[in-house]
Amino acid sequence: GYKAEVMVSQVYSGSLRVLNRHFSQDLTRRESSAFRSETAKAQKMLKELITSTRLGTYYNSSSVYSFGEGPLTCFFWFILQIPEHRRLMLSPEVVQALLVEELLSTVNSSAAVPYRAEYEVDPEGLVILEASVKDIAALNSTLGCYRYSYVGQGQVLRLKGPDHLASSCLWHLQGPKDLMLKLRLEWTLAECRDRLAMYDVAGPLEKRLITSVYGCSRQEPVVEVLASGAIMAVVWKKGLHSYYDPFVLSVQPVVFQACEVNLTLDNRLDSQGVLSTPYFPSYYSPQTHCSWHLTVPSLDYGLALWFDAYALRRQKYDLPCTQGQWTIQNRRLCGLRILQPYAERIPVVATAGITINFTSQISLTGPGVRVHYGLYNQSDPCPGEFLCSVNGLCVPACDGVKDCPNGLDERNCVCRATFQCKEDSTCISLPKVCDGQPDCLNGSDEEQCQEGVPCGTFTFQCEDRSCVKKPNPQCDGRPDCRDGSDEEHCDCGLQGPSSRIVGGAVSSEGEWPWQASLQVRGRHICGGALIADRWVITAAHCFQEDSMASTVLWTVFLGKVWQNSRWPGEVSFKVSRLLLHPYHEEDSHDYDVALLQLDHPVVRSAAVRPVCLPARSHFFEPGLHCWITGWGALREGGPISNALQKVDVQLIPQDLCSEVYRYQVTPRMLCAGYRKGKKDACQGDSGGPLVCKALSGRWFLAGLVSWGLGCGRPNYFGVYTRITGVISWIQQVVT
């Protein structure tokens, strides 16, 4: 017998422009009689138009759901019931062409055409897009709370918040032709479960989703999203019930920004400028195409592109790039958002220069991309350091920390984390270098101690960018840099005149004058350390819970020793700004650092003083005994301590700690403690300082209490945020 033909529903969404009608405010209110009568007429016209073509035999249903400016734009969807084998033949492009052809054929016709009875439809203003049944369901669920807004040039329109009786709302936004819409979303509550989705068309078409955001994102408190043109839809889905809008939405039309540039680079190394997608830091728009042409002054140089939280990867099988497509020297690469820095190094083989193209291949976009560009020496890309091929970064070599994910920076080291004597390649410990005592056979450890040397892993970089050989020369009372910069900013790290961490002892007033107690509603939550007159450093994980993310909750106490009483040396502050490290990852504890800006500067006293911050090259030698302080629990699972506890811990080699924790220890972490356990940080010590005393008597911040397995357990060390691994970010924020 005959097999019945399988029919499938094909859904289309679109808009058309009516030239003989004008938009009025009445048409924005679905309950108005104007809206009802216009919808009935427009719906009739749409059905007649479709059925006038060969699509008529497949017609199933249609609906006009909204109107907009231009003189009058109708937004609609329709469903065709088509044989499965014809599905691909009736793409949105084909359907649009058939309908336009029909409209054009009757433009000058004097014959009566049903769909022209009331409306003069502009054939050039017809748009047909692919949709789905799911899209229509999503649209219908918002129709009880549907807002249309037209925003004129030069206007910034603040959108009215959602109707909290509805579970979903849609803002249909339109701007002047030839401009693009920029939507600004600002989360105003610390926690919520609301979801917002932005679309590059008038309705919630999944295939035209620009981005969706969820739940009062703390890492992105403000999001700016660009549409590819003058139309956009925003859909809100209710989270927890709230009488306050957890966000503010505003929209403005902006002009298209050209994204093409020709640059000639100077004959110097390091960063020379910035390239970015239009309206950075706004999300790039769905049809972004950037083309940057850079000319390099000589073939000695290569071109370096330094990215922030974004990397380039080879994409297999020509799949579309979901986070931006790049072509560099005809190589296709895909962008990928990561919580790490990354550099792309482009070898230069011809003087013609390098063209870099960036394209958004799909409608789904993401945060704007910014890249610093500059030159590197092709024969020596990382002077004094190691070029990590995995991420293109220059990292310290042979310092005992595997900075490169493949660990090659710590391979083939003659002297690891020690100084290599010139004479016979023997290794001596770094504190013995430039200490006035020759330890190498011919005294090479004491050579060049008063002059500039090439920069390397353990050299200190002065402000004038020259380097000195002496390890850890900061604030030791002797100027080693020509410009004296190693002895600047040295009003730090000195204990006051002073007469529980697991296994610890009670501290006295002024003994640890940088120690901070971070409290919420009178309860000690985390430790911290004063690093500048208005800045306290702590661990990012202290703010992990959404309920802890608001600055207004926190009070910072300095000069405190006892939790249950106050003494005259103690001062308190509110928090004006809270900054988590942009690369902080909750699951891995990587980059576990946050900075709190105090509401007013501290007045230094014997009980309140900042700790010294180490330079990036500062070497905290494994084996060194340092101190941790805090009011954390005195035993695993116990209550916090009333008195400020102190305990000495030994710094542990990175490779050993990494093995103990089965390779969960990153280069931004540092381990300390004892193999027998007993002495360790515990709950409530988080964010507190791990400090090491320099030969000068000053205390330097080596780490922040971050994580570990239990407290004081045998065979498990405490893991701390390694300050030298995050110091660039700290300095960038604080200065």
Epitope: P431, Q650, I652, K676, K678
Partner: antibody
Framework: QVHLVESGGAVVQPGRSLRLSCAAS????????MHWVRQTPGKGLEWVTI????????YYTESVKGRFTTSRDNSKNTLYLQMNSLRVEDTAVYYC????????????WGQGALVTVSS | QSVLTQPPSVSEAPRQRVTISCSGG????????VNWYQQVPGKAPKLLIH???LLPSGVSDRFSGSKSGTSASLAISGLQSEDEADYYC???????????FGGGTKLTVL
């Protein structure tokens, strides 16, 4: 490179005293606990004593308590073992070994110094 | 009499695998990490395994350690003639307040 070199081994009569030294190089001596371990000829290893990096704690094995004293001079990078009232059963090769605080793992050993107690 | 008990000797042919056991009690192996040392005749001992099962850098991955309860073991795979040596286990003993060693096991590669 970490180097530990023992010296002072000798043949002595029972009841006499002897002092062993261990010169350390290639690491920051003052950061590390130091141990003495001995090995009776043809026999196994026996731990003798530990001295903390900061000299706050010193432990001895029961058989040498009251007779042996361990000390260190961090400025000279040197470890000492003062052995008094020596007995025949103290005859052994004495090794100094570096230890991480609280770990009791000996990651570097000296070449050993032979102490023979004999009449 | 050693606090930790090891077999006095083991032997195996080249390229084979051998296991050396070490048993103790709750005050040492049961509560503390086990370390293994290799001593080639006429030389000082050398750290082979620490933290029960971790290899210090420079030690061949033919060596592996494990621990269960109050017993530990050292396994050597792909035996080579240069593995001929005495092997000692060691751990801290909480009740003796000191490090205790096993009596040592002499490995012969046949």
């Amino acid at each position: 490179q970490v180097h530990l070199v023992e010296s002072g081994g000798a043949v002595v009569q029972p009841g006499r005293s002897l002092r062993l030294s261990c010169a350390a190089s290639g690491f920051t001596f003052s950061n590390f606990d130091m141990h003495w371990v001995r090995q009776t000829p043809g026999k196994g290893l026996e731990w003798v004593t530990i001295i903390r990096y900061d000299e706050t704690n010193i432990y001895y094995t029961e058989s040498v308590k009251g007779r042996f004293t361990t000390s260190r001079d961090n400025s000279k990078n040197t470890l000492y073992l003062q052995m008094n009232s020596l007995r025949v059963e103290d005859t052994a090769v004495y090794y100094c070994a570096r230890g991480w605080t609280g770990s009791y793992v000996f990651d570097y050993w000296g070449q050993g110094a032979l102490v023979t107690v004999s009449s | 009499q050693s606090v930790l008990t090891q077999p006095p000797s083991v032997s195996e042919a080249p390229r084979q695998r051998v296991t050396i056991s070490c048993s103790g009690g709750s005050s040492n192996i049961g509560n503390n990490a086990v370390n293994w040392y290799q001593q080639v005749p006429g030389k000082a001992p050398k750290l082979l395994i620490h933290y029960d099962d971790l290899l210090p850098s420079g030690v061949s991955d033919r060596f592996s350690g494990s621990k269960s309860g109050t017993s530990a073991s050292l396994a050597i795979s792909g035996l080579q003639s240069e593995d001929e040596a005495d092997y000692y286990c060691a751990a801290w003993d909480d009740s003796l307040n000191g490090v205790v060693f096993g009596g040592g096991t002499k490995l012969t590669v046949l």
